[in-house]
């Protein structure tokens, strides 16, 4: 399994290195998760031809995956640090049920899927410390999440492959947009 950020051999070999700032830690954590997603996507793409499908074709799905929009304040036009941070945290909380769904979807990358899930939980904690307006963050309803998970798991094999691919791609895009915005904060 991949080693969580801050625990690799380079860090051990350099004990006198300056401790990471909160922003650096978040940056490193997101890059670590992106590496994990990359590994999971490799397995998914080797197993099915979903990765060849056009973005337009894949957009025709009824998954309500979090996505950045202009109104969220994470793009240059209308950039708003607080609004954007709330969107990032809310989006990550919404992704958690989909990351749970991924847990039994991988054979050779089982540990990697778990690492992505656990690292995301840590990332949410880091970001919550950074946010001033925690009241604006809505937590998904556990009952709704449970029924969504049941519904996703009841799909046929092809739809499950498609769902796995879409979750990974959307999560990657959400993290990229989030980190682009966080680097401006």
């Amino acid at each position: 399994a991949p080693v969580p950020p801050g625990e690799d051999s380079k860090d051990v070999a350099a004990p006198h290195r300056q401790p990471l700032t909160s922003s650096e830690r978040i940056d490193k954590q997101i890059r670590y998760i992106l590496d994990g997603i990359s590994a999971l996507r490799k397995e998914t793409c080797n197993k099915s031809n979903m990765c060849e499908s056009s973005k337009e074709a894949l957009a025709e799905n009824n998954l309500n995956l979090p996505k950045m929009a202009e109104k969220d304040g994470c793009f240059q036009s209308g950039f708003n640090e607080e609004t954007c941070l709330v969107k990032i945290i809310t989006g990550l909380l919404e992704f958690e049920v989909y990351l749970e769904y991924l847990q039994n979807r991988f054979e050779s990358s089982e540990e990697q899927a778990r690492a992505v899930q656990m690292s995301t939980k840590v990332l949410i904690q880091f970001l919550q410390k950074k946010a001033k307006n925690l009241d604006a963050i809505t937590t998904p309803d556990p009952t709704t999440n449970a029924s969504l998970l049941t519904k996703l798991q009841a799909q046929n094999q092809w739809l499950q492959d498609m769902t796995t691919h879409l979750i990974l791609r959307s999560f990657k895009e959400f993290l990229q947009s989030s980190l682009r915005a966080l680097r401006q904060m």
């Epitope: 997101i30 890059r31 992106l34 793009f75 240059q76 990657k172 895009e173 990229q176 947009s177 980190l179 682009r180 680097r183 401006q184």
Partner: nanobody
């Protein structure tokens, strides 16, 4: 790492336009974020603009906002920087840089591959 090659620089009069290109032969270039930086003689290298893996996510330095446009053509493995309303203070060597995470940003440390640069001179 990817090998990056910039082109399109040259001498142009104030108010004129240029279109810079940043190309690579790397086949996964569509997954990289690409940034443009510039360095004027005796000055620090500074951020100009960048584009994420998702082409609708762009960012510009205040000094070029509204005058420069960054775009990408993944079929051609190329990122462009269209520069309009050029001013003498835009004179510099322009470098493109790539970030394998598809994120980019306004600091040089976010990028892992760099081109050799192309000279842009704005003068009458």
């Amino acid at each position: 790492e990817v090998q990056l090659v910039e082109s399109g620089g040259g001498l142009v009069q104030p108010g004129g336009s240029l279109k810079l290109s940043c190309t690579t032969s790397g086949r996964r270039f569509s997954e990289y974020a690409v940034g443009w930086f510039r360095q004027a003689p005796g000055k620090e290298r500074e951020f100009v603009a960048d584009i994420g893996e998702q082409a609708d996510n762009t960012w510009y330095a205040e000094s070029v906002l509204g005058r420069f446009t960054i775009s990408r053509d993944d079929a051609k493995n190329t990122v462009y920087l269209e520069m309009d309303g050029l001013k003498p203070e835009d004179t510099a060597v322009y470098y493109c840089a790539a970030d394998k995470y598809g994120v980019g940003g306004n600091a040089q440390g976010y990028y892992d591959s760099w081109g050799q640069g192309t000279q842009v001179t704005v003068s009458s």
